[in-house]
């Protein structure tokens, strides 16, 4: 808490500027009033205040709004953002993704902090869904955000904005979200012809079916290893050695180097001998 | 998942009319097939027609081309057949099934090896 006390005679600040940061914390307190704060927050970021500084508009901006900051303020706040707390934040309401934007590139290149969950979920919760253009937002700032959603949230993202998903933004997905995502993509990308199909939902298989799986199998898709080995177990236990084998294409010489790891592993041991044979890769059931 | 049901069968005279219809719940997308099939008593299973879900494109076995017509509702996610002029030939069990996924039409064609979902199949019998 800053104390209380009357604004030296000639020091009330008529406007943000650089001036200010040779004043002391009770002085800002004093001689900066709040809604000049609020009105030229934009300002503050190209001032070098100090932390203690910066605490003090803090304070000044929870007075002047304590039910939460309109989003006028919000969408300035830059470095002032890094001060607020989580329960700060969930008293906003951000509805327009060019605050959420300038909040992110305030936090950018560090890892997504409370703060920032928080902000996300405010955001998302307010628009209802996840729509594409947020997706593409929160996916360039945090590669790995699609996959920190549980499944119950990623079932709130509309088939459409799975288009704006990079392979990437997949890699840390368990197949509980990829259960999710899978059938989203299947409607997104179901227009779209044989091969470019294909390259678009590869991502995703690690969702599909043994049904899929199999209809795959019968049009040389080629699958690679990678992506073979990130499919459900269930789905490729009941798939045979003549349909494994045409699912993966020339790729097929690559299950003996998995063969000790799921979903190989498994998959091996539910086939004849004689079958596992007819590959020529010496693998044992 | 898709779920396959089909209804419709029944006995009628040569010469006469039935249409087959197949409700398909589940995932139902553009990029499916889905076809009728046949068995007769002692034979095998054998294509009928086939239909390319998302563009309306369609395939007959050369026994009903002309006389067969398969067409689908998108909005009830349902497959109909509808068979004129039937023949004694044409009694058999037949059966809706679907492609979940055709990365081309042509691979739509009704061969049943490539089809991986059933329906348990509906009774259909043509008295001379």
């Known amino acids: 808490e800053v104390e209380k006390t009357a604004c030296p005679s000639g020091k009330k600040a008529r406007e943000i500027d650089e001036s200010l940061i040779f004043y002391k914390k009770w002085e800002l307190e004093a001689c900066v009033d709040a809604a000049l704060l609020a009105t030229q927050m934009d300002r503050v970021n190209a001032i070098p205040f100090t932390y203690e500084q910066l605490d003090v508009l803090k304070h000044k901006l929870d007075e002047l709004y304590p039910q939460g900051y309109p989003e006028s303020v919000i969408q300035h706040l830059g470095y002032l953002f890094l001060k607020m707390s989580p329960e700060d934040i969930r008293k906003w309401n951000v509805t327009s993704l060019e605050t959420l934007k300038a909040l992110l590139e305030v936090n950018k290149g560090h890892e997504m902090s409370p703060q920032v969950a928080t902000l996300i979920d405010r955001f998302v919760k307010g628009r209802g869904q996840l729509d594409k253009d947020t997706l593409d937002t929160l996916t360039a700032f945090y590669p790995g955000y699609l996959c920190s959603l549980s499944p119950e949230e990623l079932s709130s993202v509309p088939p459409s904005s799975i288009w704006a998903v990079r392979p990437q933004d997949l890699d840390t997905c368990d197949p509980r979200q990829l259960d999710v995502l899978y059938p989203k993509a299947r409607l997104a990308f179901q227009n779209m012809n044989g091969s470019e199909y294909f390259v678009k939902i590869q991502s995703f298989l690690g969702g599909a079916p043994t049904e899929d799986l199999k209809a795959l199998s019968q049009q040389n898709v080629s699958m690679d290893l990678a992506t073979f080995m990130k499919l459900r177990t269930d789905a490729v236990l009941p798939l045979t050695v003549a349909e494994v084998q045409k699912l993966l294409g020339p790729h097929v010489e690559g299950l003996k180097a998995e063969e000790r790891h799921r979903p190989v592993r498994d998959w091996i041991l539910r086939q004849r001998q004689d079958d596992l044979d007819t590959l020529g890769l010496g693998l044992q059931g | 998942q898709v779920k396959l049901v089909e209804s419709g069968g029944g006995s009628v005279q040569a010469g006469g009319s039935l249409r087959l219809s197949c409700a398909a719940s589940?995932?139902?997308?553009?990029?499916?097939?889905m076809g009728w099939f046949r068995q007769a008593p002692g034979k095998e299973r054998e294509g009928v027609a086939s239909?390319?879900?998302?563009?309306?494109?369609?395939n007959y076995a050369d026994s009903v081309r002309g006389r067969f017509t398969i067409s689908q509702d998108n909005a009830k996610n349902t497959l109909y057949l509808q068979m004129n002029s039937l023949k004694p030939e044409d009694t058999a069990m037949y059966y809706c099934?679907?492609?979940?996924?055709?990365?081309?039409?042509?691979?739509?064609?009704?061969?049943?090896?490539?089809?991986?979902?059933w329906g348990q199949g509906t009774q259909v019998t043509v008295s001379s």
């Open positions: 099934a679907a492609i979940t996924v055709a990365l081309t039409r042509a691979f739509c064609a009704p061969i049943p090896s490539r089809y991986t979902n």
């Open positions: 589940g995932n139902v997308y553009n990029n499916m097939c």
């Open positions: 239909i390319y879900v998302g563009g309306g494109y369609t």
